[in-house]
């Protein structure tokens, strides 16, 4: 039960990419405000986004403390202008979120091809190691720092003149592939965490093609 004229939040949803993590919910408030609390399974509740009229709350700062922990959030509803008011049970109306484990569930952001370099019939393609908001010793960690060898990249590459996509995989951020001399190739990469059962793949990077400024060609 809750305070008169307040409704409980619903459709609590975690939106997370490369550990940037926002809790969203409904409905848009009418004469009410929300406060969010977050905790690990064994920890204490911490309040965030106090008395907000938003229907989202950025919880990144909390979850990056330990991305392998499982988190639970709850959204409290209060009457606008009377936030001390409680329901008949002596506490405000609230709704729990689904559990969320960032390491297992954060979406992999769209990767970027940093560079490619052709030397004869070999091309070295480098994927940008994206910075996350996870910190260690006051330094922001990269995606590779966080996931280590759990993270792989799939490279799709194809001759500009054909449609069939060859693939290569790496558990670093670099590919070394064989190409036909005199042919222009295009490239796209995808981040993958094979050990996951959900959110295994990122969206594809923008396509980069030889003959464009990102690449470098050296005839040996």
């Amino acid at each position: 039960s809750g305070t008169t004229n307040t409704v409980a939040a619903y459709n609590l949803t975690w939106k997370s990419t490369n550990f940037k993590t926002i809790l969203e919910w409904e409905p848009k408030p009418v004469n009410q405000v929300y406060t969010v609390q977050i905790s690990t399974k064994s920890g204490d509740w911490k309040s965030k986004c106090f008395y907000t009229t938003d229907t989202e709350c950025d919880l990144t700062d909390e979850i990056v403390k330990d991305v392998k922990q499982t988190y639970l959030a709850r959204v409290f509803s209060y009457p606008a202008g009377n936030v001390e008011s409680t329901g008949s049970a002596g506490e405000p109306l609230y709704e729990n979120s689904p559990e969320f484990t960032p390491y297992l569930e954060t979406n992999l952001g769209q990767p970027t091809i940093q560079s490619f370099e052709q030397v004869g019939t070999k091309v070295n393609v480098t994927v940008e190691d994206e910075r996350t908001l996870v910190r260690r010793n006051n330094t922001f960690l990269s995606l590779r720092d966080v996931f280590g060898k759990d993270l792989i990249y799939t490279l799709y590459y194809w001759k500009s003149s054909s449609s069939g996509k060859k693939t290569a995989k790496t558990n670093t951020n670099e590919f070394l592939i064989d190409v036909d001399k005199g042919e222009n190739y295009c490239f796209s990469v995808q981040a993958v965490i094979p050990s996951r059962t959900v959110n295994r793949k990122s969206t594809d990077s923008p396509v980069e093609c030889m003959g464009q400024e990102k690449g470098e060609f050296r005839e040996i």
Epitope: Y156, K165, A168, K169, D178, V198, D204
Partner: antibody, heavy 120, light 107 residues
Framework: EVQLVESGGGLVQPGGSLRLSCAAS????????IHWVRQAPGKGLEWVGY????????YYADSVKGRFTISADTSKNTAYLQMNSLRAEDTAVYYC?????????????WGQGTLVTVSS | DIQMTQSPSSLSASVGDRVTITCRAS??????VAWYQQKPGKAPKLLIY???FLYSGVPSRFSGSRSGTDFTLTISSLQPEDFATYYC?????????FGQGTKVEIK
């Protein structure tokens, strides 16, 4: 439980067409890659092609290029192999298989296969 | 395309025998080689991945090794259920390619 079930095989005349289906359960195909592999009677395994259902990217063996098309419907969790201009040498059991997607593990689950016979 | 040359094409062995099957890649494939077992009328089953790693649920009598571009599947003590055809496959480059297969028969 991960399962792949092929269907759609049968007898077809040379020059004809056939569409095979590969229905997946126990996993979401968009998170993986699906390959088709065939085996002519009494012969070895021959890779046919793959699809990444997440983006529709495909690649085909030279022997089927231009005649076969792999597609996927992620809403049905099913991959397809459209075979056109069929020849006698396409007679085989056709398997779909799941590509785990890591640097190490490759085709970890296979369907039971469906027989395609091309004959007049 | 990379060729995988498998030998022998067939062999006869008895229960308890140590059996070795080899596969040679026509160029470097790193460790991107898998071994599959296939029984008549059935789909292939993954045995070994990444040249030497035993796939989940596969008996420990199966093992794999690599020496340069040569790959070996060993069955330390052949069991009745091991009589089947074995295939190697490289997945280092597209297209992935299979060896011709080795049929292990009862002596």
């Amino acid at each position: 439980e991960v399962q792949l079930v092929e269907s759609g095989g049968g007898l077809v005349q040379p020059g004809g067409s056939l569409r095979l289906s590969c229905a997946a359960s126990g996993f979401t195909i968009s998170g993986y890659w699906i390959h088709w592999v065939r085996q002519a009677p009494g012969k070895g395994l021959e890779w046919v092609g793959y699809i990444d259902p997440a983006n529709g990217f495909t690649y085909y063996a030279d022997s089927v290029k231009g005649r076969f098309t792999i597609s996927a419907d992620t809403s049905k969790n099913t991959a397809y192999l459209q075979m056109n201009s069929l020849r006698a040498e396409d007679t085989a059991v056709y398997y779909c298989a799941r590509d785990y997607g890591s640097v190490r593990v490759f085709l970890d689950y296979w369907g039971q296969g469906t027989l395609v016979t091309v004959s007049s | 395309d990379i060729q995988m040359t498998q030998s022998p094409s067939s062999l006869s062995a008895s229960v308890g025998d140590r059996v070795t099957i080899t596969c040679r890649a026509s160029q470097d494939v790193n460790t991107a080689v898998a071994w599959y077992q296939q029984k008549p009328g059935k789909a292939p089953k993954l045995l070994i991945y990444s040249a030497s790693f035993l796939y989940s649920g596969v008996p420990s009598r199966f093992s794999g090794s690599r020496s340069g571009t040569d790959f070996t599947l060993t069955i330390s003590s052949l069991q009745p259920e091991d009589f089947a055809t074995y295939y190697c496959q490289q997945h280092y480059t597209t297209p992935p390619t299979f060896g011709q297969g080795t049929k292990v028969e009862i002596k």
